[in-house]
């Protein structure tokens, strides 16, 4: 087992008021991914709704770096390379779970947090609102 | 706090041999999401690379329900509704963290797991390999 130093002010697993707390083994199991997955290849360049990847960094969070997609255009790229503004590039979003130390600086106490990330972009037909 | 029944054979937080284990608060904080976000709206129908959402359910996992995208076509849908097979619909994938009960059926003992999910689809220009 691991000898974890008890920091003052850190929650205690025996504390009855510790809210909705569970034990989590941090040895991550890779269910259907390799340890070094190819991340959606180069789709961000080849897509008709291309996107750029921006680094979202927070050392107090795990994972510390999350890559966020930002669509390059309002419209979609046609075969000739021009942008068609009759179509829309939109972000595809996904809720992901992250870990955050809570209270901060406690080595063995965490809180699950849900964040919404943009994973990539897709090209959609716009919703046209007709004015009477 | 929540009274969690102690299943026989379930790890105990005081167990010295409990591997790489930490306390995690499951009162999930939604940093930038609503509690019931509109999942990328109706993009799955309006996209030029439309997809179907398949329910992946596992009561031993948190979250127990994950929606997986499957692209409807090999090609992409044109303005006239026909499929253009000179373009490809491809899934955008994301690695996410989930919690899995370990040992199974234990209410307060989990293991972190990393899974690859398809979030949606995008339309890409194919890579053409020319044979000499």
């Amino acid at each position: 087992g691991i000898a974890i130093p008890r920091n003052s002010g850190c929650p205690n697993s025996e504390d009855k008021n510790f809210p909705r707390t569970v034990m989590v083994n941090l040895n991550i199991h890779n269910r259907n991914t390799s340890t070094n997955p190819k991340r959606s290849s180069d789709y961000y360049n080849r897509s008709t709704s291309p996107w750029n990847l921006h680094r979202n960094e927070d050392p107090e969070r795990y994972p510390s770096v999350i890559w966020e997609a930002k669509c390059r255009h309002l419209g979609c790229v046609k075969a000739d390379g021009n942008v068609d503004y009759h179509m829309n590039s939109v972000p595809i979003q996904q809720e992901i779970l992250v870990l955050r130390r809570e209270p901060r600086h406690c080595p063995n106490s965490f809180r699950l947090e849900k964040i919404l990330v943009s994973v990539g972009c897709t090209c959609v037909t716009p919703i046209v609102h007709h004015v009477a | 706090g929540i009274a969690i029944p102690r299943n026989s054979g379930c790890p105990n937080s005081e167990d010295k041999n409990f591997p790489r284990t930490v306390m995690v608060n499951l009162n999930i904080h939604n940093r930038n999401t609503s509690t019931n976000p509109k999942r990328s709206s109706d993009y799955y129908n309006r996209s030029t690379s439309p997809w179907n959402l398949h329910r992946n359910e596992d009561p031993e996992r948190y979250p127990s329900v994950i929606w997986e995208a499957k692209c409807r076509h090999l090609g992409c849908v044109k303005a006239d509704g026909n499929v253009d097979y000179h373009m490809n619909s491809v899934p955008i994938q994301q690695e996410i963290l989930v919690l899995r009960r370990e040992p199974r059926h234990c209410p307060n003992s989990f293991r972190l797991e990393k899974i690859l999910v398809s979030v949606g689809c995008t339309c890409v220009t194919p890579i053409v390999h020319h044979v000499a």
């Epitope: 070094n36 997955p37 990847l53 999350i66 130390r101 | 790489r20």
Partner: antibody, heavy 124, light 109 residues
Framework: QVQLQQSGPGLVKPSQTLSLTCAIS??????????WGWIRQSPGRGLEWLGR?????????DYAVSVKSRITINPDTSKNQFSLQLNSVTPEDTAVYYC??????????????WGQGTLVTVSS | DIVLTQSPATLSLSPGERATLSCRAS???????LAWYQQKPGQAPRLLIY???NRATGVPARFSGSGSGTDFTLTISSLEPEDFATYYC??????????FGQGTKVEIK
């Protein structure tokens, strides 16, 4: 399998520029699941990370604060290699320089492939 | 920068004995971003453990890693002659904070 082959001079004069190249085989410098870095090792300093480049729809450069004003790491996609330039060197920059692949899968970070190392001596 | 302090500086043991190497961080680091390397004279470091406890490809089962927060351990259950080398821990806290420990030399007693 992935291999890194380093090349460059072993002797550099003080105040000049140290230049090393790392050729990649078995992977791409533009890979979206790796970063490419330089690390040096000297008796006085131990192992010291200098910086990395990574490609995620554009090139990202990250440099250690200790060398930030003097370092440049550049990719060469046509030759599938990357280079290190360290300006205004002093004898304290004498070290064995390693290039390495940093696995960068969001959930882990570590150096799994290393070059053979190049001893660079800064002396007049 | 986060400072990683390895102890002991030198460990004198005989083949077959158990080696326990310690790495202590000056502040909390994510265990997922903690790695261990082995280095022999004249060679580049070789990855042994990543994510504090995951063995790299081809690394024998006698090597194991553990720890969280600020305290991490590399254990070699039964030393083989080829295990006598210097071992380094390394952490990644952010894109600009990546540091190595000063090393523990495991030598033949």
């Amino acid at each position: 399998q992935v291999q890194l082959q380093q090349s460059g001079p072993g002797l550099v004069k003080p105040s000049q520029t140290l230049s090393l190249t790392c050729a990649i085989s078995g992977d791409s410098v533009s890979s979206s699941s790796a970063a490419w870095g330089w690390i040096r090792q000297s008796p006085g300093r131990g192992l010291e990370w200098l910086g990395r480049i990574s490609y995620r729809s554009k090139w990202y450069n990250d440099y250690a604060v200790s060398v930030k004003s003097r370092i440049t790491i550049n990719p060469d996609t046509s030759k599938n290699q990357f280079s290190l330039q360290l300006n205004s060197v002093t004898p304290e920059d004498t070290a064995v320089y390693y290039c390495a692949r940093e696995v960068d899968s969001m959930y882990y970070s570590y150096f799994d492939i290393w070059g053979q190392g190049t001893l660079v001596t800064v002396s007049s | 920068d986060i400072v990683l302090t390895q102890s002991p500086a030198t460990l004198s043991l005989s083949p077959g004995e158990r080696a326990t190497l310690s790495c202590r961080a000056s502040q909390n680091v994510w265990a997922f971003y903690l790695a261990w390397y082995q280095q022999k004279p004249g060679q580049a470091p070789r990855l042994l453990i990543y994510g504090a406890s995951n063995r790299a490809t081809g690394v024998p089962a006698r090597f194991s890693g553990s720890g969280s927060g600020t305290d991490f351990t590399l254990t070699i259950s039964s030393l083989e002659p080829e295990d006598f080398a210097t071992y380094y821990c390394q952490q990644y806290r952010s894109t600009l904070s990546l540091t190595f420990g000063q090393g523990t030399k495991v030598e033949i007693k």
